[in-house]
């Protein structure tokens, strides 16, 4: 068997809402993956499990099942959404994300994703980790690759 390549492309969009009373931030983060099947037979993308970390704390998890079948020598782009919650001991972030004097409220998140593929009863897992920045102050749509973590205004990690 040849390789199945998984490439994490980046954040596609981040939609934010707040619970004012609870000082809680809700971020729905949609990510994009490219999965390439280098084999001469079809493979099934059985599931994608993802989690998002902020400051070493897991703030969101998602799992997608029975996603798609990728034909021989084909590639598919898959979007998946992880709902995240920043609250409790991180409620200071509420003040950062709602501070009106800041233009772009970028926070650095670690995106972790594991793709499970199957072919002829054989299962294979491929994992990726990537730091991305996301604006927690407004709804944002990103050009693919635009959210790559470089050097952004952010609270202490």
């Amino acid at each position: 068997p040849r390789s199945i390549d998984v490439k994490y492309i980046g954040v596609k969009s981040a939609y934010v809402s707040y619970d004012v009373q609870k000082r809680t931030i809700y971020l729905n983060i949609t990510n994009t993956l490219n999965i390439t099947n280098n084999n001469y037979y079809s493979v099934e993308v059985e599931n994608i499990t993802a989690q998002v970390q902020f400051s070493k704390t897991v703030i969101g998890k998602a799992r997608l099942n029975n996603i798609t079948i990728i034909g021989p020598l084909d590639m598919k782009q898959i979007d998946y959404t992880v709902p995240t919650v920043i609250a409790e001991e991180m409620s200071y972030m509420y003040d950062f994300c709602t501070l009106i004097s800041i233009k772009v409220h970028n926070i650095v998140l670690m995106m972790q994703v594991t793709v499970t593929t199957t072919y002829f009863g054989h299962s294979e897992q491929i994992s990726q980790e990537r730091y991305q920045y996301v604006d927690c102050g407004r709804n944002t749509t990103y050009q693919l690759g635009q959210s790559e973590y470089l050097n952004v205004l952010q609270p202490q990690q």
């Epitope: 934010v16 809402s17 707040y18 004012v20 200071y92 003040d95 950062f96 709602t98 501070l99 009106i100 004097s101 800041i102 233009k103 772009v104 102050g137 407004r138 205004l153 609270p155 202490q156």
Partner: antibody, heavy 120, light 112 residues
Framework: EVQLQQSGAELVRPGASVRLSCIAS????????MYWVKQRPEQGLEWIGR????????EYVPKFQGKATMTADTSSNTAYLQLSSLTSEDIGVYYC?????????????WGQGTSVTVSS | DVLMTQTPLSLPVSLGDQASISCRSS???????????LEWYLQKPGQSPKLLID???NRFSGVPDRFSGSGSGTDFTLKISRVEAEDLGIYYC?????????FGSGTKLEIK
């Protein structure tokens, strides 16, 4: 330490213009909006407007449109307020202000104020 | 523009008393993100204003807990539970929800 250092007091002739400066230290002004506030003698605070120093985009209170011009120079980390066609109505103290973020909390920053006197 | 109306203009108090200042906005000042950017400042003579409360009731760092803010929509209140000498000065409410931002006219807290 985050600081806003404003230029010294100005005594100007009626009809003249003056440019006030506000030098920021401890943070990069291009990451924040900068605001200007006016206070006439023995009067309250009046919000003049705000500037996005990165692209120069400005918002003014209508009564200050044409009277005040906000600019910024990101290379020197300085915000400016120009006042034109000065009259006795423009006498007062002018403050620059912004709110920055420091690790886990916000910091409210005000300059010490620049006093403008208009007299012939 | 949003007009901020403060009452009273002057508030004579005895040290140790409770003081209450009211601020009313001419329109709802809930920001599009759901937050209400209603703030309270204290200005002492010859000094720059100092932020006490932001987002209606959030006491700013270093502000004593005798200061509290409340309200919603268009009606807001600042309470000082036990007035101390260092609390004397002029209090301003401020709205930062809708551009152009606006201050109230101020309330002078003074000794009776």
């Amino acid at each position: 330490e985050v600081q806003l250092q404003q230029s010294g007091a100005e005594l100007v002739r009626p009809g003249a213009s003056v440019r006030l400066s506000c030098i920021a230290s401890g943070f990069n002004i291009k990451d924040y909006y900068m605001y200007w506030v006016k206070q006439r003698p023995e009067q309250g605070l009046e919000w003049i407007g705000r500037i996005d120093p990165e692209d120069g985009d400005t918002e003014y209170v209508p009564k200050f449109q044409g009277k005040a011009t906000m600019t910024a120079d990101t290379s020197s980390n300085t915000a400016y307020l120009q006042l034109s066609s000065l009259t006795s109505e423009d006498i007062g103290v002018y403050y620059c202000t912004t709110r920055t973020w420091d690790l886990y909390y916000a910091v409210d920053n005000w300059g010490q104020g620049t006093s403008v006197t208009v007299s012939s | 523009d949003v007009l901020m109306t403060q009452t009273p203009l002057s508030l004579p108090v005895s040290l140790g008393d409770q003081a209450s200042i009211s601020c009313r906005s001419s329109q709802n000042i809930v920001h599009s993100n759901g937050n209400t950017y209603l703030e309270w400042y204290l200005q002492k003579p010859g000094q720059s204003p100092k932020l006490l409360i932001d987002k209606v009731s959030n006491r700013f760092s270093g502000v004593p807990d005798r200061f509290s803010g409340s309200g919603s929509g268009t009606d807001f209140t600042l309470k000082i539970s036990r007035v101390e000498a260092e609390d004397l000065g002029i209090y301003y409410c401020f709205q930062g929800s809708h551009v152009p931002f606006t201050f109230g006219s101020g309330t002078k807290l003074e000794i009776k």
